[in-house]
């Protein structure tokens, strides 16, 4: 079969299959029959993360502290800066352009997964036998107190928001 395209890291221009520029470099001039593709490294605070024919590098993302952001990983000529959120905050989107406070799990719900800089708190309803009586971003559902192990009896049943109330056993004479 005869060839049907330029090779993978090439692009077609003026009948020539020219080499693309490597990550971290931008295109200055296309190749010709006599000259090679001319590429230049991206400047400080710029990047290109793929083989490309871009004439401008992209600016590194700015992690704006006013939006609760901080640098998680500094950008290079081949990678963008990665932002994350300050303690107690998480990103509002995958691209992490701003931050919001972690939500708390209301009474009757416990923390299934503690929030990170990029994900919010995940709450779950307390199942039978467990309760949470606080609004918290850290507390899991706690098991009801076991009255039996204390030689006590249940005086008031527990709910998903309250613990059981234990009391002494009735003494029969």
């Amino acid at each position: 079969e005869p060839p049907t395209a330029c090779r993978e890291k090439q692009y077609l221009i003026n009948s020539q299959c020219c080499s693309l520029c490597q990550p971290g470099q931008k295109l200055v001039s296309d190749c010709t029959e006599f000259t090679e593709t001319e590429c230049l490294p991206c400047g400080e605070s710029e990047f290109l993360d793929t083989w490309n024919r871009e004439t401008r590098c992209h600016q590194h993302k700015y992690c704006d502290p006013n939006l609760g952001l901080r640098v998680q990983q500094k950008g290079t000529s081949e990678t963008d800066t990665i932002c994350t959120c300050e303690e107690g905050l998480h990103c509002t989107s995958e691209s992490c352009e701003s931050c919001v406070p972690h939500r708390s799990c209301l009474p009757g719900f416990g923390v299934k997964q503690i929030a990170t800089g990029v994900s919010d708190t995940i709450c779950e309803p307390c199942p039978v036998g467990f309760f949470s009586n606080v609004s918290s971003a850290f507390e899991k559902c706690r098991p009801w107190t076991s009255c039996e192990t204390k030689d006590l009896v249940v005086q008031q049943a527990g709910t998903n928001k309250t613990d059981v109330v234990c009391g002494p056993q009735d003494r029969q004479r």
Epitope: P3, K9, Q16, Q22
Partner: antibody, heavy 125, light 107 residues
């Protein structure tokens, strides 16, 4: 300017291996496939295979399958060709050449636009 | 593999002569043919590609023609620097294959 500079002449005994290097300069090394060819004394040119310097993928001619290994080191823009189990009929000048595809009259064409100076390999007991 | 047959294998000519070399492919290769020139002790260099297209920098006394299976390279007026060996090569399919070469010698 674009240049391919090959390693020097080698004299080897039958059964031995030889490794020839080809250093590229003046262009984006991973952007173009590299061919290896050879020319026995007074003979025509014979294609041995290619390597894609970006991925390291190779395609060897049937005749050399199992005896030839093509590798590259992109950090030094150099391609290598190793031929093992040498025989006297492997005595030849070995060339690396850059593949340059072109588009002309609605078709793509592959040619070898830049060649190394050649490396003479002599196999003799 | 596509067989490439070149003729003649050698020829003697004088400066100023018109010289024609032919190349036949074992199957239809459309116009996927390159011609290379090799001077003694040197690496080959591309002369014509594809079939009839002359790269800039190659003197206009060189011309190529043909398509399908039959191709030719013509030097309209042989110059001293033209003595050497000429190879045809098909790039229609892998592996690329070469003709046996034509050695152009001084008569």
């Amino acid at each position: 300017q674009v240049q391919l500079v090959q390693s020097g002449a080698e004299v080897k005994k039958p059964g031995a291996s030889v490794k020839v290097s080809c250093k590229a300069s003046g262009y984006t090394f991973p952007g173009y496939y590299m061919y290896w060819l050879r020319q026995a004394p007074g003979q025509g040119l014979e294609w041995m295979g290619w390597i894609n310097p970006d991925s390291g993928d190779t395609n060897y001619a049937q005749k050399f399958q199992g005896r030839v290994t093509m590798t590259r080191d992109t950090s030094i823009s150099t391609a290598f060709m190793e031929l093992s189990r040498l025989r006297s009929d492997d005595t030849a000048v070995y060339y690396c050449a850059r593949e340059k595809p072109r588009y002309f009259d609605s078709f793509y064409y592959y040619l070898m636009d830049v060649w190394g100076q050649g490396t003479t390999v002599t196999v003799s007991s | 593999d596509i067989q490439m047959t070149q003729s003649p294998s050698s020829l003697s000519a004088s400066v100023g002569d018109r010289v024609t070399i032919t190349c036949r492919a074992g199957q239809n290769i459309s116009r996927h043919l390159n011609w290379y020139q090799q001077n003694p002790g040197k690496a080959p260099k591309v002369l014509i590609h594809p079939a009839s297209s002359l790269p800039s920098g190659v003197p206009s006394r060189f011309s190529g023609s043909g398509s399908g299976t039959d191709f030719s390279l013509t030097i309209s007026s042989l110059q001293p620097e033209d003595f050497g060996t000429y190879f045809c090569q098909q790039s229609y399919s892998t592996p690329p294959t070469f003709g046996g070469g034509t050695k152009v010698e001084l008569k």
